[in-house]
């Protein structure tokens, strides 16, 4: 019996009956073995067949078969109802050998030449499988020359059986307070050869409750519990299972916050496991009271571990811990079963005792020291010398504790002094200088430093003065001896004030001209206003209409008299507004330089002199009265003018004020 | 982490005014709390002074109101203490302190030794 | 001003004894009070607060208790640590502070 060719040889090659192509004789037999590579199959096919045709193919014959298995037993030239001749059939080894048979009997009725047949390895495709058989693997199936090779799907590996994909399903850990876990793949059968264990763990003081939920279906036995696929439940005090079979397990209620579950299965079965719903529970927190005038968010019908609730207090009240201010407020409940922090209080908001005011007085509207939420306080300045600043003076206790103005300030309001108030009545008329009675010119200011010098009271802080009269002691503002509230300049009893800081104008040059000369002197207090302290005006825009050429100034102060000394007593003169052109014209001839009086200076006395100011005049406030107003306003300050004060055909100089608002308020604004 | 910082003089004159700076990190003086002053006097008497709270509001002690400010600077997350007029009374170790009644935890500066003396 | 009086000036204890803090307001403080450490060199520490609420940190051997106008702290299982001075404070009108009890090994 020829044996085929056997691999690692070429396996292909030609079979044929003995004689082909001529007849075959009687009572032959032969065999052909032949094997290919493991994980090749053979392939054959006949290219001529013509043996004699008997019942059931018993005379002549040539049989194909593979291991135990006969593939086929052929005969015949044409296939008929129970012969079978191979025609254009393909035949194929089962595994990796063919065994091939021909046989003839002793007689031939005539004579057949038998058959001839090709024969080749090729790969066997061990991933494509007959319908209703098992797949070779559980996932992905690879084939290549020769074999095949099985793969699985994420989150699964290949057992080591090579076909089975077992499910990766240890080591998951649910912490949240309720969740779901169920077998792999659920609804879908659960993967074979697997073991998975899941755990639940929550915090300390949490206890797990199981609930089976949809459907339950692992491979069980009728008589012996769960042999095959489990599912055991496992707590710090008890085990629960193991469970198998179609019936959905009861409620777990576990009493711990720890649950370990694994469910194990075998090799065979087509089932669709399990789902599990979890949810906890906790020792519930006492239900929380809000305090009055508040409540409490979110509510729940019951409140448990880590479960918390805030307070909101109504509008005009506020979270406070005993003194102890809140802007939020937020309680845990902890495992005890205790809150971890008590319950704040939801008090009135109170703004407390209005701050006094300077120079004014404030009235409880709502009831006497009522300063709780939406109380009313009244505030006012005192009378005559005082007035209110753009304010009402009204202040409500708003919800965020702070006096508010209906204007929306928290600020005080301010008590500004009313300015330009004097005792004096004018006459119109020129006079000569006269003393100066209580009240006449009650912004008028003694400046001693080095020399005697005036200046005017702005505001209750600040000073108007000249340049020149205090420029030694810009850098030195505490040397200035500021005097105010008396008429007699050596008198003891007045109101002291002390500079701060000296502002001079940055366009003055000293010992050059007198363009500019206007200083401020801001002081370190406030001072109280009264009929004797009170500040002059600063000019209004429309204040020109009152200072036109010969309308009347008043200068005022303690400088030189008529008798070559300073003035005892306060001293005043009314004096007209000169042109000035006229002015100009009159300080141009020497020993006057050129340019002397610019348009930063107003001239004011009598061409026929003697009503004048002089020296110690210095800083002080050339005034008039702005008769829409009915108050006094600056219009010059005491500057220069010839050296023999009130000399006729010469006028005092002032340093033009209105031309100096801005840098007045600029600065009393920025200091 | 919280923290608080105090900072000023150690050493000021009677009649002058003592001033300190808390300086905040960790956590915003605005968000919530009251932010407080209190000094340990020698003997080691603990005194409240007083406090300024999230909204700027401001508590002081009754005995000490009439020479006493407490104010804050939100860019800066600071607040401090002005205390007008001392006297040799008023030396202590001056802390600052986050105290919030439980809701939340109590934070103290290190303290800042002040001695008042001419 | 509602006073805090910490009567006990001193305390002797020893090691693993248990000791009680007291402290009496002049007045009626609801709850609101809190226990305070401090260490020598050191900023106060607190322990306790609302009476009876431990801060988070605190050892379980503090204990506060009390409400009104009495008020107690206990440490139990004393340790060498616990060596300090401890104060109480009032937060429910303004805030006072008691004058202090200085805990010392007997």
């Known amino acids: 019996t020829p044996l085929g060719p056997k691999w690692p040889e070429p396996v292909f090659g030609r079979l044929a009956s003995p004689g082909f192509p001529g007849e075959y004789a009687n009572d032959q037999e032969r065999r052909w073995t032949l094997t290919a590579p493991p994980g090749y199959r053979l392939r054959l096919y006949f290219t001529h067949f013509d043996l004699e045709l008997s019942h059931l193919c018993e005379y002549d014959f040539v049989k194909l078969s593979s291991g135990a298995k006969v593939l086929a037993t052929l005969c015949g030239q044409e296939s008929t109802d129970t012969e079978r001749a191979p025609g254009k059939d393909t035949f194929y080894s089962l595994g990796s050998s063919l065994d091939i048979t021909f046989r003839s009997d002793y007689s031939n009725e005539k004579p057949f030449t038998g058959f001839e047949a090709f024969y080749a390895a090729e790969d066997i495709d061990e991933c494509q499988v007959a319908p209703g058989e098992a797949p070779t693997c559980d996932h992905h199936c690879h084939n290549h020359l020769g074999g095949f090779y099985c793969s699985c799907r994420a989150g699964y590996v290949l057992h080591r059986n090579k076909r089975t994909c077992s499910a990766l399903c240890s080591g998951q850990v649910f912490t949240q307070r309720s969740g779901e876990l169920s077998s792999p793949e659920y609804p879908r059968p659960y993967p074979k050869l697997s073991s998975c264990t899941y755990s639940i763990s929550l915090e300390e003081g949490f206890s797990v409750i199981l609930d089976f939920v949809e459907s339950f279906d692992v491979e069980t036995h009728p008589e012996t519990l769960c042999p095959y696929d489990f599912l055991k439940i496992q707590t710090d005090r008890e085990e629960h299972g193991p469970f198998c079979g179609k019936t959905l397990p009861h409620r777990i209620e576990t009493k711990s916050n720890t649950v370990t579950i694994t469910f194990v299965t075998d090799e065979s079965g087509d089932h669709t496991g399990w789902k599990i719903h979890y949810t906890s529970t906790a020792q519930p927190c006492p239900y929380p009271m809000a305090p009055p005038n508040g409540h409490v968010s979110p509510v729940q019908a019951k409140y448990i571990l880590k479960d918390s609730f805030s307070i909101f207090c109504e509008t005009g009240y506020e979270l406070l811990q005993g003194h102890l201010p809140l802007k939020s407020f937020t309680a845990v409940c902890q495992k005890d079963g205790s809150w971890d922090r008590p319950m704040p209080a939801c008090s009135i908001v109170d703004c407390g005792p209005p701050d006094d005011l300077p120079s004014g007085r404030v009235e409880y509207i709502t009831g006497p020291g009522v300063t709780t939420y939406k109380a009313v306080i009244q505030y006012s300045c005192e009378e005559t010398f005082y007035t209110m600043k753009v304010n009402d003076g009204k202040y409500v206790c708003e919800a965020d504790g702070f006096w508010t103005s209906s204007k929306g300030e928290k600020s005080l309001p301010v008590c500004e002094p009313v300015c330009g108030l004097s005792a004096r009545t004018t006459g119109g008329r020129i006079y000569g200088g006269q003393k100066a009675k209580p009240g006449d010119f009650p912004w008028q200011v003694l400046i001693l430093g080095g020399t005697t010098a005036a200046g005017a009271l702005l505001y209750d802080n600040w000073v108007l003065t000249a340049a020149h009269a205090v420029y030694e002691q810009k850098h030195d503002a505490s040397a200035l001896d500021i005097r105010m509230g008396t008429l007699k300049r050596l008198s003891p009893h007045y109101t002291q004030a002390w500079s701060e800081a000296v502002f001079i104008h940055e366009g003055y040059t000293h010992d050059a001209g007198f363009d500019n000369d206007i200083a401020l002197i801001k002081l370190n207090n406030k001072v109280v206003i009264n009929s004797n302290i009170t500040p002059i005006c600063l000019p209004r825009k429309e204040a020109e209409s009152f200072m036109r050429t010969d309308d009347i100034g008043t200068a005022s102060g303690w400088g030189l008299t008529q008798r070559g000394f300073l003035a005892r007593n306060l001293m005043y003169v009314d004096i007209p507004i000169v042109d000035h052109q006229k002015c100009t014209a009159a300080y141009e001839k020497p020993p006057y330089p050129r340019g002397s009086v610019t348009a930063n200076m107003l001239c004011a006395g009598l061409e026929s002199g003697g009503k004048d100011s002089c020296r110690g005049d210095s800083g002080g406030a050339l005034v008039f009265l702005d008769s829409e107003t009915e108050r006094w306003f600056v219009g010059g300050i005491v500057s220069w003018g010839s050296m023999n004060c009130g000399e006729a055909g010469q006028y005092g100089v002032y340093t033009k004020v209105i031309n100096y608002i801005p840098w007045i308020e600029n600065i009393i604004s920025d200091f | 982490d919280v923290q608080l910082q105090e900072s000023g003089p150690g050493l000021v004159k009677p009649s002058q005014s003592l001033s300190l700076t808390c300086t905040v990190t960790?956590?915003?003086?605005?968000?919530?709390?009251?932010w407080n002053w209190i000094r340990q006097l020698p003997g080691n008497k603990l005194e409240w002074v007083g406090y300024?709270?999230?909204?700027?509001?401001?508590s002081y002690n009754p005995s000490l109101k009439s020479r006493i400010s407490i104010t804050r600077d939100t860019t800066k997350n600071q607040f401090f203490l002005q205390l007008n007029s001392v006297t040799t009374e008023d030396t202590a170790t001056y802390y600052c302190?986050?105290?919030?009644?439980?809701?939340?935890?109590?934070?103290w500066g290190q303290g800042t030794s002040v001695t008042v003396s001419s | 001003n509602i006073v805090m009086t910490q009567s006990q000036k001193f305390m002797s204890t020893s090691v693993g004894d248990r000791v009680s803090v007291t402290c009496k307001a002049s007045?009626?403080?609801?709850?609101?009070v809190a226990w305070y450490q401090q260490k020598p060199g050191q900023s106060p520490k607190a322990l306790i607060h609302?009476?009876?609420y431990r801060y988070s940190g605190v050892p379980d051997r503090f204990t506060g208790s009390g409400s009104g106008t009495d008020f107690i702290l206990t440490i139990s299982n004393v340790q060498s640590e616990d060596l300090a001075e401890y104060f109480c404070?009032?937060?429910?009108?303004?805030?006072?502070f008691g004058s202090g009890t200085k805990l010392e090994l007997k």
């Open positions: 404070l009032q937060y429910n009108s303004y805030l006072t």
């Open positions: 007045q009626n403080v609801d709850t609101n």
């Open positions: 302190a986050k105290l919030a009644g439980g809701h939340g935890m109590d934070y």
């Open positions: 609302s009476a009876s």
């Open positions: 300024i709270s999230y909204s700027g509001r401001t």
């Open positions: 960790g956590y915003s003086i605005t968000s919530d709390y009251a």
